[in-house]
């Protein structure tokens, strides 16, 4: 169900788009992204738009996880799929609090 959750939750915020260590949104996010030839990076934050990103399957380059309780993204660890290189790397979307 991609309907926007009505209740706001507090989330851990650790990404280049965070003003402070926490944010408030409709859900919490954890994004693991690996750019070609570089180490994977983990971003934690909030989501309010583009909830379809939560449904994406993990790939070799991106894993986008969403959860719906306050600070549920604080200790989540993600892994990337060990698949063949796709023709295009997906773009990571992080929501500013």
């Amino acid at each position: 169900d991609l309907a926007k959750p009505s209740k706001l939750v507090n989330c851990t915020c650790e990404s280049p788009h965070c003003k402070r260590p926490f944010c408030q949104g409709s859900w919490c996010t954890v994004v693991l992204v690996r750019e070609q030839g570089r180490h994977p990076q983990v971003y934690r934050g909030c989501g309010s738009l583009n909830q379809e990103l939560c449904l994406g399957r993990p790939t070799e380059f991106l894993n986008h996880h969403c959860c719906y309780r306050s600070f549920c993204n604080h200790n989540v660890s993600l892994m990337l799929e060990a698949t063949q290189t796709p023709s295009e790397e997906p773009e990571v979307d992080a929501h500013l609090p």
Epitope: P16, D93, H95, L96
Partner: antibody, heavy 113, light 111 residues
Framework: EVQLLESGGGLVQPGGSLRLSCAAS????????MSWVRQAPGKGLEWVAN????????NYVDSMRGRFTISRDNSKNTLYLQMNSLRAEDTAVYYC??????WGQGTLVTVTS | QSVLAQPPSASGTPGQRVTISCSGS????????VYWYQQLPGTAPKLLIY???KRPSGVPDRFSGSKSGTSASLAISGLRSEDEADYYC???????????FGGGTKLTVLG
């Protein structure tokens, strides 16, 4: 690749108006808050305004509130800055920035009589 | 006058470690993340440090950030000639409800 391309700068007389545009590509524009930051010649960076993902929240630096208006069109992947009642002290390079990581190359606004 | 205070200049020789300070208040650095940007001559600012001490991918680990109370610092170790640039700290300010920058520090690599 994230790209931000500003346009609309130029020479304008005091009291005049300009509308700056910033064309975004390489990312889902509607997922990010955006800012305008300016830099007067030989000076430091000064934040101008920002706007949230859907355009419902806007913040301005006090000295520009009322004269400048930030807006966005997510269907066109474009950020705007409408500047009215321009003064000589508004002369600067204006940068469009994805909060808080990527910046465009800037567009020069010169206010002179 | 900038809300965040930085020294106007700093210098060092190749291989040295240089530190640039950034002083603020409880409404900005004290309660929010600190960011550091590098601006090479004639170019747009580039993000060096976010979230007080995190590096975006592609930024060398010679650059490190720290924060304590209402002050922050950027350290550059193994100084190189290509590090010669202006460095700016930034943070969100809850009182002003806006982003504030330091006045910038011009780093000169001697010799």
């Amino acid at each position: 690749e994230v790209q931000l391309l500003e346009s609309g700068g130029g020479l304008v007389q005091p009291g005049g108006s300009l509308r700056l545009s910033c064309a975004a590509s390489g990312f889902t524009f509607s997922s990010y808050a955006m800012s305008w930051v300016r830099q007067a010649p030989g000076k430091g960076l000064e934040w101008v305004a920002n706007i949230n993902q859907d355009g419902s929240e806007k913040n301005y630096v006090d000295s520009m509130r009322g004269r400048f208006t930030i807006s966005r069109d997510n269907s066109k992947n474009t950020l705007y800055l409408q500047m009215n009642s321009l003064r000589a002290e508004d002369t600067a390079v204006y940068y469009c920035a994805r909060e808080f990581d990527y910046w465009g190359q800037g567009t020069l606004v010169t206010v002179t009589s | 006058q900038s809300v965040l205070a930085q020294p106007p200049s700093a210098s060092g020789t190749p291989g040295q470690r240089v530190t640039i300070s950034c002083s603020g208040s409880s409404s900005n650095i004290g309660s929010n993340y600190v960011y550091w940007y590098q601006q090479l001559p004639g170019t747009a600012p580039k993000l060096l440090i976010y979230g007080n001490n995190k590096r975006p991918s592609g930024v060398p680990d010679r650059f490190s950030g720290s924060k304590s109370g209402t002050s922050a610092s950027l350290a550059i170790s193994g100084l190189r000639s290509e590090d010669e640039a202006d460095y700016y700290c930034a943070a969100w300010d809850d009182s002003l409800n806006g982003r504030v920058f330091g006045g910038g520090t011009k780093l000169t690599v001697l010799g």
